[in-house]
Interface confidence: medium
Amino acid sequence: LECYSCVQKADDGCSPHRMKTVKCGPGVDVCTEAVGAVETIHGQFSVAVRGCGSGIPGKNDRGLDLHGLLAFFQLQQCSEDRCNAKLNLTLRGLNPAGNESAYEPNGAECYSCVGLSREKCQGSMPPVVNCYNASGRVYKGCFDGNVTLTAANVTVSLPVRGCVQDETCTRDGVTGPGFTLSGSCCQGPRCNADLRNKTYFSPRIPPLVLLPPPTTAAPSTRAQNSSSTTSTAAPTTTTSIIKPTTAQASHTSPHEMDLEVIQEEGASLSGGAAGHGGTAGHGGAAGHQDRSNMEKYPGKGGAQIPAKGGS
């Protein structure tokens, strides 16, 4: 079997001229394409993977909402040569674009990472945006998390930051087959610089503080967590669709998740690796286009965020 192969990380890695073909290994009988689009009130981007897969042919579409962060996921598997180029990986431009000035800021201020690489979305590096309320929904919280897409033995992960409706969520997430959008929320100006280590303590309940014994003179030290890299190849074990076993999606790299193997609507994701040479990471961020109102995601159709009406 021969399949198209590409990786798109909020850039143009799966644009027409960058398409590769790859011969699948023995026992690999489907070509896979998966795309996940994420939209914040300040912009949108998509991640996508094409390559050799496993399982049975089928299609799986899903719209997801995480505290006002919208995600749309599509998975398509097929069994003919080079059949995995049916999904539209293009984000349709919102109408009108760049219309944020039409909305009244509600006082909340957050870091925004929309299609930015992990390097450009560290600490206080990313741009700061003013939150606003849209379609009667109040966006006064800030979010720090990741979107992760696993398909064809490749895992693509990008940071997501922006304004959300919740101000206290902790390691919350939504999942589709091989797709996870997860993270934590906070309250206060620019509070979402790094919420990876946020605990489940409510802001109204003071956390338990362990005081050192009176006899100890040495100051207490805090263990520092090193940042985990998420844009790595998936484990080489042949599994089907992955989902966190916990009720809430882990806010860590896919390798740190406890995974269970499930089969969903006839489409599974892993299989022969679709080699890609340097296609991910080029180009820069996706277009920053503002959302003026929120529409529901369609159940079917191209993997693109629907155009929004302006004011």
């Epitope: 850039d11 027409p16 960058r18 984000l91 431009g93 040479g277 180009g283």
Partner: antibody, heavy 117, light 112 residues
């Protein structure tokens, strides 16, 4: 029917500027990656610049980097190429092309840019 | 000097079969990127002839076929006709240059 119509070419002195336009019709322009490709008289095709559908990702050939700027207006279905600091070697027919099925599937008729003193 | 190498000229008589080669490297054709072929008739804009190594857009006669192997690709024209007289260009993405690249072009002459 897909149509791409270039305009804005002409005669210009070295160091001068020109702005090329490409009016698109017959397809959803805002979903299409677009490129400029040029062809010097009697020579082969040379890719010049590329812009993604949203306009967020842009590439240039080394020969024009820093002098040419590609842009698009999806509301007007128009692609642009702003050419500054023009040189004699920029003399060519400039084509705008749509990227479709992994290739430039539609081309405009071209507009001639002549740089001479 | 083009990144993809094509013979500058080729010729054949009507009815003959002609093949045009396109040689690349490990950063373009050899990296797995698909190859496309364009036909440019005299005084006109280029037209897509073969895409995705061996696929024909609608309207292109099946006399035209493409193939790819390793770091090379080729365009074959069978049952040559006088209207096939044109310049032919191959193209592919190049990983190292991070852009699309063209061959230098092959001028096909139909003799007689």
């Amino acid at each position: 029917e897909v149509q791409l119509l270039e305009s804005g070419g002409g005669l210009v002195q070295p160091g001068g500027s020109l702005r090329l336009s490409c009016a698109a019709s017959g397809f959803t322009f805002s979903n299409a990656w677009m490129s400029w490709v040029r062809q010097a008289p009697g020579k082969g095709l040379e890719w010049v610049s590329y812009i993604s559908s949203s306009g967020s990702t842009i590439y240039y050939a080394d020969s024009v980097k820093g002098r040419f700027t590609i842009s698009r207006d999806n509301s007007k279905n128009t692609l642009y190429l702003q050419m500054n600091s023009l040189r004699a070697e920029d003399t060519a027919v400039y084509y705008c092309a749509r990227e479709g099925l992994w290739a430039f599937d539609y081309w405009g008729q071209g507009t001639l840019v002549t740089v001479t003193s | 000097q083009s990144v993809l190498t094509q013979p500058p000229s080729a010729s054949g008589t009507p009815g003959q079969r002609v093949t045009i080669s396109c040689t690349g490297s490990s950063s373009n054709i050899g990296a797995g990127y698909v190859v496309h072929w364009y036909q440019q008739l005299p005084g006109t804009a280029p037209k897509l002839l073969i895409y995705d190594n061996n696929k024909r857009p609608s309207g292109v006669p099946d006399r035209f076929s493409g193939s790819k192997s390793g770091t090379s690709a080729s365009l074959a024209i069978s049952g040559l006709r006088s209207e096939d007289e044109a310049d032919y260009y191959c193209a592919a993405w190049d990983d190292r240059l991070n852009r699309p690249v063209f061959g230098g072009g092959t001028k096909l002459t139909v003799l007689g």
